[in-house]
C-alpha cells in the first residue's frame, strides 16, 4: 500500500475585535474565515508545484475576539492603533508550534495600501514561513514566524471578497517561500504587449490587484519554482494527511452535524462541543432540529427559522436572502439584472456579483488614465474607459469623448481601488498612492534584530 501524502497545511485563524465589529456575529465571522480558506484551498489544490500536487488547507482552530474582548488584557490585538509590522509581531509573539500557519484577520486601515504581511519561507537556513517553530530571537523574545496577517480595509473602503481572497493567497504564498514576482515572464500585467497585459498579473505581484483578470488567482512560474523548493524541504515537518474533519474548528465539515467549537467557545444549546466524547462531539443534541453553527437559518432555540425570515441583506447585485423553513443554510439570493450599477456607479453587476467596470455597460473596457509623462496624474483615480483593445482611446468618464454615456460626469474610483496600472491604490483624496510592497517586512526584520527601532505600545 502507498503511504498517504502529507499535503495538508493546518491553520490557526484568529480574528480581532475590529473584524468582529465589521461582520457583526460569530457566524458571519466564521463564514468569512471559511470562504477565505476555501478560496486559497482551491488555488493551491489546482496548482502543480513541480510535481507536488493537491496542497490543501484545513482550519485546525479559530479564535474570534469579539467586541467584548476589546478591553481584555489577555487579548494581544486589543490596541486600536497598531501599525502593520507591530500587528504581525503580536501574532508572532504567541506560540504556534501546533500549526502549519497562524493568521490574524482584521479590519484595520494600515498605511500605504498594505493589505497583508507575512514571513517569507525559505528551503533552508532562514527563519519564517510554513512549519517554523517558536524560538528565541536576538531581540530577546520568543517568536513563531509561521505567521501572517490580512486586513479587509484599504484607504477607508472595504476590499471586495475576491481581492481579500487573493491577498490571503498572496501572504500564504510568502509563507510557502515565494517572494514578489519580478521580471517580464512573471509580471505580464506590466507588459507593453496588449495580449499579455490583458490577462493581468499573478498572485505574487508586488503591488495592487483587481482580482478579476485571468492571472490574478494563479501562481506565476517564478512563484511555483520557489514554492516547490520550500515544500520539498519543509512539508514533512508539519503537513498532515488530508481526510478527517476537525471537530472544534467552528466549521461544519463533511462527517459533522454541527461544530460550535471547544467547550470554552461553544455558546450553542444545540450542538455537543468538541470536548465531548468521540460519539457525541460535533453532533446535534437529541431532539434538536439544527444548530446555528450550520447556518443563519437556525434559531438559538435549535429550530429552523420560518419561511419568510431574512438571512442575508440585499446588496448592490443580489436581492436579500430568505430562509426556506427546512434548512439552516441561507438559500442563494436572486441576482439583480446584469449591468445594474454597483459600487457607487463605478462597476456593474454580472451574474449577481459586482464584477464588471461601468465601462462595460456601454461596450467599452476599463483602462488606466496614465500619461507616460506623468502630466495627467489627477486623472489616475478617475474611472477611465477605452474601446476594446485600443489604449489610444483611453479617456476619463468625465471627458467629452465619453459624454454620450456619462454626460460629462466624472466617475471616480472608490478609495482603495487599484490605480496607475496596478502600481498603487486611490486614497480618500483621489490621489493614486504607490505601494511600497517590500517596506514593512524589511522594517520588521530590522526591528527583530535591532529592537531599539521599536516603540512599546502604550494602552
Amino acid at each position: 500500500t502507498t503511504s498517504a501524502e502529507k499535503n495538508t497545511c493546518q491553520l490557526y485563524i484568529q480574528t480581532d475585535h475590529l473584524f468582529f465589529k465589521y461582520y457583526g456575529t460569530r457566524e458571519a465571522v466564521i463564514a468569512q474565515i471559511s470562504s477565505h480558506v476555501k478560496a486559497i484551498d482551491t488555488i493551491y489544490q489546482t496548482t502543480d508545484f513541480s510535481g507536488i500536487r493537491n496542497i490543501s488547507f484545513m482550519v485546525k482552530r479559530i479564535r474570534i475576539n469579539t467586541t467584548a474582548d476589546e478591553k481584555d488584557p489577555t487579548n494581544p490585538f486589543r490596541f486600536p492603533n497598531i501599525g502593520v509590522e507591530k500587528f504581525l509581531e503580536l501574532n508572532s509573539e504567541q506560540n504556534h508550534d501546533d500549526y502549519c500557519l497562524a493568521y490574524v484577520f482584521t479590519d484595520r486601515d494600515f498605511d500605504d495600501g498594505v493589505l497583508g504581511l507575512a514571513w517569507v519561507g525559505a528551503p533552508s537556513g532562514s527563519s519564517g514561513g510554513i512549519c517554523e517553530k517558536s524560538k528565541l530571537y536576538s531581540d530577546g523574545k520568543k517568536k513563531s514566524l509561521n505567521t501572517g496577517i490580512i486586513t479587509v480595509q484599504n484607504y477607508g473602503s472595504h476590499v471586495p471578497p475576491k481581492v481579500s481572497h487573493i491577498t490571503f493567497a498572496h501572504e500564504v504564498g510568502h509563507n510557502f517561500g515565494s517572494p514578489h514576482d519580478s521580471g517580464t515572464e512573471c509580471t505580464p500585467g506590466e507588459s507593453k504587449n496588449l495580449g499579455q497585459k490583458e490577462n493581468g498579473n499573478y498572485i505574487m505581484y508586488a503591488r495592487a490587484t483587481s482580482g478579476d483578470k485571468l492571472n490574478n488567482n494563479k501562481f506565476s512560474l517564478c512563484s511555483i519554482r520557489n514554492i516547490s523548493q520550500v515544500l520539498e524541504k519543509k512539508r514533512n515537518n508539519c503537513f498532515v494527511e488530508s481526510g478527517q474533519p476537525i471537530c472544534g474548528n467552528g466549521m461544519v465539515e463533511q462527517g459533522e452535524e454541527c461544530d460550535c467549537g471547544y467547550s470554552d467557545q461553544c455558546k450553542d444549546e444545540c450542538c455537543f462541543d468538541a470536548n465531548q466524547p468521540e460519539g457525541r462531539k460535533c453532533k446535534l443534541k437529541p431532539g434538536k432540529q439544527c444548530s446555528p453553527s450550520q447556518g443563519p437559518c437556525c434559531t438559538a432555540q435549535c429550530a429552523f427559522k420560518s419561511k419568510s425570515e431574512k438571512c442575508r441583506d440585499d446588496s448592490d447585485c443580489a436581492r436579500e436572502g430568505i430562509c426556506n423553513g427546512f434548512t439552516a443554510l441561507c438559500p442563494a439570493s436572486d441576482p439583480k439584472p446584469n449591468f445594474t450599477d454597483c459600487n457607487r456607479h463605478t462597476q456593474v453587476c454580472i451574474n449577481g456579483q459586482c464584477a464588471g467596470s461601468i465601462c462595460e455597460k456601454y461596450g467599452l473596457e476599463e483602462c488606466t488614465c496614465a500619461s507616460s509623462d506623468g502630466k495627467d496624474d489627477k486623472e489616475l483615480c478617475h474611472v477611465c474607459c477605452m474601446k476594446k483593445m485600443d489604449p489610444s482611446t483611453c479617456a476619463s468618464t468625465g471627458s467629452v469623448q465619453w459624454s454620450r454615456h456619462f454626460s460629462g460626469r466624472t466617475i471616480t474610483l472608490q478609495p482603495g481601488s487599484p490605480c496607475n496600472d496596478f502600481r498603487g491604490y486611490c486614497d480618500v483624496f483621489m490621489r493614486c498612492r504607490l505601494v511600497d510592497a517590500d517596506g514593512p517586512l524589511a522594517r520588521l526584520k530590522k526591528a527583530i534584530f535591532s529592537p531599539e527601532l521599536y516603540e512599546n505600545i502604550a494602552e
Epitope: D390, A395, S399, V400, R404
Partner: nanobody
C-alpha cells in the same frame, strides 16, 4: 457596410460661406456620433465639430466656434457643416467620421471615415 460620403467642398473667397454634407449609410444613424475633421497640407488632422445623433448634442473646436454650425437630418441620414466667415486658414481637406461609442474631436476615437472633400479659401 458603413459608408460616409462628403460633398459640398470648393473654392470660396475669404468671408464667404460653404455647406458641407456627409451622407451616411450601412448603420443605424441614431446610434452614432458624426464628427467633422480637417487636414491642411503638412499639418495634423484636427477636429472641427461633432454631433450625437441620439440627442442632438454638439461640440466645436475653439477655432470655429461662432462661425461653423453642425446639424443633421436624421430622415436623410445626413449631417451638415455650415461654414460662415471663412478664413484662409480654414483651407484643408474636410473629412466626416462616425462612431457608435465615442464623441468629441479626437480622431483616434472614430472608427469610420469618408474620403474627404477639399475646401480652399482664397484671400
Amino acid at each position: 457596410e458603413v459608408q460616409l460620403v462628403e460633398s459640398g467642398g470648393g473654392l470660396v473667397q475669404a468671408g464667404g460661406s460653404l455647406r458641407l454634407s456627409c451622407a451616411a449609410s450601412g448603420f443605424t444613424f441614431d446610434d452614432y456620433a458624426i464628427g467633422w475633421f480637417r487636414q491642411a497640407p503638412g499639418k495634423e488632422r484636427e477636429g472641427v465639430s461633432c454631433i450625437s445623433m441620439s440627442d442632438g448634442s454638439t461640440y466645436y473646436a475653439d477655432s470655429v466656434k461662432g462661425r461653423f454650425t453642425i446639424s443633421s437630418d436624421n430622415a436623410k441620414n445626413t449631417v451638415y457643416l455650415q461654414m460662415n466667415s471663412l478664413k484662409p486658414e480654414d483651407t484643408a481637406v474636410y473629412y466626416c467620421a462616425a462612431d457608435r461609442l465615442a464623441f468629441g474631436l479626437d480622431s483616434n476615437f472614430y472608427d469610420y471615415w469618408g474620403q474627404g472633400t477639399q475646401v480652399t479659401v482664397s484671400s
